[in-house]
């Protein structure tokens, strides 16, 4: 019961986390204009991974996509890659974990297969969460560096009178969503891995016993009943970890159309 609860909770927490990672990746507010010096601004700038936007005091908002790949900073590309890898791994992990849930019966799938799948999805969630946390942290570091650089060059004199005031950017809401979502996915993955240990059946060795039926001298070896009883030394469920070899009960999952942003 505790194992089912742990697995179910791990799945739900990971699901919320991955939804959060997707939301953070799509959000426009990764960096927002710093309003420390001017809390009432006429033009409020904010930027995401895919486009930059302006909200005017008139109420109008306009966004411009980054319509170039080569012209973008390498760090931004790296953050995009980390977030997408996190989403894809998380999505595959979710698909695998659905089939691994103890409360869902699929054919004659055995506990060892479910344990394997639970572990696989757990690892995927952990890596997914780490990718998201890494991506958000890299972006945050980039912001901090740029913030202090633009503070140092806040006013660049041009011909004495003209000033170029650099727009400083600070942490946007997407960063916090990403950190929390990555953390939740990571926690969900750990819970799945813990649940996997409980799902794995104990290895039981039954000794061959000779049964003597009265009046007959025929010895019955339990190995002969293995197909129906599951007894015997070479049963399918004896070995918990099979080094990645898949049984025919396991379902391989591929990224579906919903796995892509």
């Amino acid at each position: 019961m505790a194992v089912t609860a742990c697995q179910g909770l791990g799945f739900v927490v990971s699901l919320i986390g991955i939804a959060g990672i997707i939301a953070a990746t799509c959000m426009d507010q990764w960096s927002t204009q710093d309003l420390y010096n001017n809390p009432v601004t006429a033009v409020f700038n904010y930027q995401g991974l895919w486009r930059s936007c302006v909200r005017e005091s008139s109420g109008f908002t306009e966004c411009r996509g980054y319509f170039t790949l080569l012209g973008l900073p390498a760090m931004l590309q790296a953050v995009r890659a980390l977030m997408i890898v996190g989403i894809v791994l998380g999505a595959i992990g979710l698909l695998v974990s659905i089939f691994a849930l103890k409360c869902i019966r699929i054919g004659s799938m055995e506990d060892s297969a479910k344990a394997n799948m639970t572990l696989t999805s757990g690892i995927m969630f952990i890596v997914s969460g780490l990718c998201a946390i890494a991506g958000v942290s890299v972006f945050a570091n980039m912001l901090v560096t740029n913030f202090w650089m633009s503070t140092a060059n806040m006013y660049t004199g041009m011909g004495g009178m003209v000033q170029t005031v650099q727009t400083r950017y600070t942490f946007g809401a997407a960063l916090f969503v990403g950190w929390v979502a990555g953390g939740l996915t990571l926690i969900g993955g750990v819970m799945m891995c813990i649940a996997c240990r409980g799902l794995a059946p104990e290895e039981t060795n039954y000794k061959a016993v000779s049964y003597h039926a009265s009046g007959h001298s025929v010895a019955y070896k339990p190995g002969g009943f293995k197909a129906s009883t599951g007894f015997g030394s070479n049963t399918k469920n004896k070995k918990i970890y099979d080094g990645g070899a898949r049984t025919e009960d396991e379902v391989q999952s591929y990224p579906s159309k919903h796995d892509y942003v």
Epitope: N45, V54, S57, S58, F60
Partner: antibody, heavy 118, light 113 residues
Framework: QIQLVQSGSELKKPGASVKVSCKAS????????MNWVRQAPGQGLEWMGW????????TYAEDFKGRFVFSLDTSVATAYLQITSLKAEDTAVYYC???????????WGQGTLVTVSS | DIVMTQSPDSLAVSLGERATINCKSS????????????LTWYQQKPGQPPKLLIY???TRESGVPDRFSGSGSGTDFTLTISSLQAEDLAVYYC?????????FGQGTKLEIK
């Protein structure tokens, strides 16, 4: 079509108060900010400030803090400018203007001349 | 506050000729978020309120004749009337909408030579 209709000219004595109204039609007043602009006789345009449409919160330019008050009455789709303790230098044409895309003033009232004279 | 400086203060141009008015701001008006310049041009005829001509430095307002065009970026902007008509005689103002308080140029009076 969009129209901003302002109240008529006012002649006031120094120290008095005046309230200029600006009635909006053809659009929803609460969807757009309302700006106030002053133009002294023979002079250029001076932005006095604006009032946020959703909150009704006014923002005043430095020279217009204190004696100038912007307000909205959404029930009659009207914006108001009140000036207290009038001085001779307040003599000007006062315009209301709608804030639009690009932070531009796209529609203007016809203007209200306020004359302060003893 | 951002200071807007127009030049010249007055301009006399023959009908059918090109008229050019300049506007310089004390700060950059280019927004990094949408790559727009928050500069607007207005036309004011005697006894009338100002009329919006061009916003975002170069976008013509609907209904404005195409002889009016705006250009420039950052801190230097230009309003050009390609072929001056009698009805274009007015005072022209530039205004920045990049930061509060919004500020206007002192105006350029356009007259017939």
């Amino acid at each position: 079509q969009i129209q901003l209709v302002q109240s008529g000219s006012e002649l006031k004595k120094p120290g008095a108060s005046v309230k200029v109204s600006c009635k909006a039609s053809g659009y929803t007043l609460t969807n757009y900010g309302m700006n106030w602009v002053r133009q002294a006789p023979g002079q250029g345009l001076e932005w006095m400030g604006w009032i946020r449409p959703n909150t009704g919160e006014p923002t005043y330019a430095e020279d217009f803090k204190g004696r100038f008050v912007f307000s909205l009455d959404t029930s009659v789709a009207t914006a108001y400018l009140q000036i207290t303790s009038l001085k001779a230098e307040d003599t000007a044409v006062y315009y209301c203007a709608r804030l639009y895309r690009g932070n531009t003033l796209d529609n203007w009232g016809q203007g209200t001349l306020v004359t302060v004279s003893s | 506050d951002i200071v807007m400086t127009q030049s010249p203060d007055s301009l006399a141009v023959s009908l059918g000729e090109r008229a050019t008015i300049n506007c310089k701001s004390s700060q950059n008006l280019l927004s990094s978020g949408n790559q727009r310049n928050y500069l607007t041009w207005y036309q004011q005829k005697p006894g009338q309120p100002p009329k919006l001509l061009i916003y975002w430095a170069s976008t013509r307002e609907s209904g404005v004749p195409d002889r009016f065009s705006g250009s420039g970026s950052g801190t230097d902007f230009t309003l050009t009337i390609s072929s001056l008509q009698a009805e274009d005689l007015a005072v022209y103002y530039c205004q920045q909408g990049y930061s509060f308080p919004f500020t206007f140029g002192q105006g350029t009076k356009l007259e017939i030579k």
